[in-house]
């Protein structure tokens, strides 16, 4: 008799997920030498910890604490890039500007990137048919709350100006309810961080409006300012040619504006 | 066959300055993390310092962080460990060793020995 | 600075088994690779187990290590006199960004 396993909205465990994380820290570790001694099996082991045998729908912060041990990685504190829906482009950035880190260029970031997973109440089992959905079935699932502990401690880590790239497409360019808005601009630490510095990221090759002065801008300004951390922005208006003057700076083009 | 062959050790006064040597062969030593260990008369091992390969990162103990220097020399195959206000307990044999990517040391030099007294 | 527990000493009888513990922290064997080191009185020391329990070529197989949440342990089956020595575990620790060695244990063969 099949054993009844609950139905989620979202989808499942993506496929070989274990495998998966265990090749990806062995990778990280190669690529990163100064992690060279970290043992990826235990990392994998309180990784599958804090979700294994619990209901996907009452996982907290706690369940993760075993594996956040891991994430006293040192990145510089003062070269932090943080993100809101424009991924894509801020880990373009940071392969050129290599001594700039999204928290996806951490270990623990660099594992769960793309991926989903959860387990069941009471069964060892990793569920590969659905998983919760944020929305639809509940915002305290493996992989809401995996992001939301490794966002507020990285978050939390940065120091002197912290960068933010966001997306001047969307019609919020700053949305309350992403993990930027509703976490990480929350936890960074005035004492330690001094300036927060937006980066408006332009779609259209012909927008030349300036997107520093949108309503939603402003409202993270004042988010910021009431936190004591000052605030700047900037218009990059040709993201191609943003990262082409990354790559060469010395480029006589990229004097002027981008 | 990989040879490390440390000098510079011996006798100085607390406060005073020493400068350790090793010289590197049988290996690609600009490519390996390489490191300082020291022994104290009838105690245990102590890690004292590591330098990266590539653009150097240096790692310190609790114990001599500011105090010591660790550095390398590729063109030269040699490590060196420069050691400022020298103490007492600072007393051991000074080993150099080679460091392997999964971070264990797998070649050792014979040590040298450094006495700090007055 | 605290290092790795291990038990002082250990001995047994030529032909026997023993084992030495190493207990740490997450810091240090919770989530890094353990080593051991052989160590004779005025040689240089000996990697014998990486990777909490791969052999360099070279090491007999009497000698096997194993780890499980924050410790380790080393185990020399078949007890020879020349196991006579110190043995050392060693970890990185992310708190302290160095390694930390264990206090070393004393092997004696009986």
């Known amino acids: 008799v099949p054993r009844w396993r609950q139905q989620w909205s979202g989808p499942g465990t993506t496929k070989r997920f274990p495998e998966t994380v265990l090749a990806r820290c062995v990778k990280y570790t190669e690529i990163h030498p100064e992690m060279r001694h970290v043992d990826c099996q235990s990392v994998w082991d309180a990784f599958k910890g804090a979700f294994i045998s619990k209901h996907p729908c009452n996982i907290t912060e706690e369940d993760y604490q075993p594996l956040m041990k891991l994430g006293t990685q040192t990145v510089p504190c003062n070269k932090i890039l943080l993100w809101s829906r424009i991924k894509d482009l801020a880990h373009q950035f940071t392969q050129v500007q290599r001594d700039m880190f999204t928290l996806e260029d951490t270990l623990l970031g660099y594992l769960a990137d793309d991926l989903t997973w959860c387990g069941e109440f009471n069964t060892s089992k990793i569920n590969y048919q659905s998983c919760p959905d944020w929305r639809k079935d509940c915002s305290n699932n493996p992989v809401s709350v995996f992001w939301k502990t490794v966002s507020r401690r990285f978050a939390e880590a940065a120091c002197d100006v912290v960068h933010v790239m966001l997306n001047g497409s969307r019609s919020k360019i700053f949305d309350k309810n992403s993990t930027f808005g509703s976490v990480e601009v929350h936890n960074l630490q005035p004492e330690k961080v001094q300036t927060l510095e937006a980066w408006v990221i332009h779609g259209g090759r012909e927008d030349s409006r300036d997107l520093c002065q949108d309503p939603t801008i402003k409202e993270l300004e004042s988010i910021i300012s009431k936190r004591n951390i000052q605030f700047s922005c900037k218009n990059i208006y040709r993201p191609d040619k943003f990262l082409q003057c990354v790559k060469n700076p010395e480029d006589s083009s990229c004097t002027s504006e981008i | 066959q990989v040879q490390l062959v440390e000098s510079g050790g011996g006798l100085v006064k607390p406060g005073g300055s020493l400068r350790l040597s090793c010289a590197a062969s049988?290996?690609?030593?600009?490519?390996?993390?390489m490191s300082w260990i020291r022994q104290a008369p009838g105690k245990g091992l102590e890690w004292v310092a590591s330098?990266?390969?590539?653009?150097?990162?240096?790692y310190y103990a609790d114990s001599v962080r500011g105090r010591f220097t660790i550095s390398r020399d590729n063109a030269k195959n040699s490590l060196y460990l420069q050691m400022n206000s020298l103490r007492a307990e600072d007393t051991a044999v000074y080993y150099c060793a080679r460091e392997a990517w999964g971070g264990e040391f797998t070649d050792w030099g014979q040590g040298t020995l450094v006495t700090v007294s007055s | 600075q605290a290092g790795l527990t291990q038990p002082p000493s250990a001995s047994g009888t030529s032909g026997q088994r023993v084992t030495i513990s190493c207990s740490g922290s997450s810091s240090n064997i919770g989530f890094h690779f353990v080593y051991w080191y052989q160590h004779l009185p005025g040689t240089a020391p000996k990697l014998l187990i990486y990777?909490?329990?791969q052999r360099p070529s070279g090491v007999p197989d009497r000698f096997s290590g194993s780890k499980s949440g924050n410790s380790a342990s080393l185990a020399i089956s078949g007890l020879r006199s020349e196991d006579e020595a110190d043995y050392y575990c060693?970890?990185?620790?992310?708190?302290?960004?160095?390694?930390?060695f264990g206090s070393g244990t004393k092997v004696t063969v009986l």
């Open positions: 060693a970890a990185w620790d992310d708190s302290l960004s160095g390694y930390v």
């Open positions: 049988g290996f690609t030593f600009s490519d390996d993390y």
């Open positions: 990777k909490n329990n």
């Open positions: 330098v990266s390969n590539g653009r150097p990162t240096t």
